[in-house]
Interface confidence: low
Amino acid sequence: ACDTATCVTHRLAGLLSRSGGVVKNNFVPTNVGSKAF
């Protein structure tokens, strides 16, 4: 299972995003995309 900080947030958010991760369905910027250095 995905265990990074990114993924933990993703599981809580539950929605797919274009970045490959998931985001909350609102207009507030959130740190929950596919982590890129």
Partner: antibody
Framework: EVQLVESGGGLVQPGGSLRLSCAAS????????ISWVRQAPGKGLEWVAE??????????HYAEAVKGRFTISRDNAKNSLYLQMNSLRAEDTAVYYC?????????????WGQGTLVTVSS | EIVLTQSPATLSLSPGERATLSCKAS??????VSWYQQKPGQAPRLLIY???NRYLGIPARFSGSGSGTDFTLTISSLEPEDFAVYYC?????????FGQGTKLEIK
Amino acid sequence: EVQLVESGGGLVQPGGSLRLSCAASGFTFSNYWISWVRQAPGKGLEWVAEIRSESDASATHYAEAVKGRFTISRDNAKNSLYLQMNSLRAEDTAVYYCNCYFDYGLAIQNYWGQGTLVTVSS
Amino acid sequence: EIVLTQSPATLSLSPGERATLSCKASKRVTTYVSWYQQKPGQAPRLLIYGASNRYLGIPARFSGSGSGTDFTLTISSLEPEDFAVYYCSQSYNYPYTFGQGTKLEIK
């Protein structure tokens, strides 16, 4: 204009300590996840440590190679990131980059500093 | 830790040609893969994130594809400034890891 400026690198003896700094400007620093990534001379990239944003409780994660020796921290009031490096070894010799990352959901921001060289040698 | 293996180690091509770089993960990483370009004496530059999304300002000739364990960076028509070292990375599991790099050189 976005800027990330690392400092604090230099020559240190094995077993010694250094504190690297990364000064940020031009963006809302507290919103960003930040990593230190290093690159040994002539080698590839290696992730060192990560600190999450203020809203994510500034949680930290470390590579096994530095766990217990390095500490990542941030001062959002000063727009600064730090890496306290103790018990330094020859294999820690590298250029150290700070990298800031923020996700808007449909887009991301990703900034790199120019790097600071750490040389561990007797 | 998840190991990323890039191939080939060196790719010799001419401007105008198509470049295909591979990155294989030792375990499934869904789409948590990014690609970076690095030139001598410079910091890495993000090209692709989420396996297939071009970063801001990256030319359309760069594209990424793949999911699971196999990923590809394609440069459709090489420009002189594209000759550099390319790294893939994964952020599916800690520790975040990078591939060893592919050097794209002028033939």
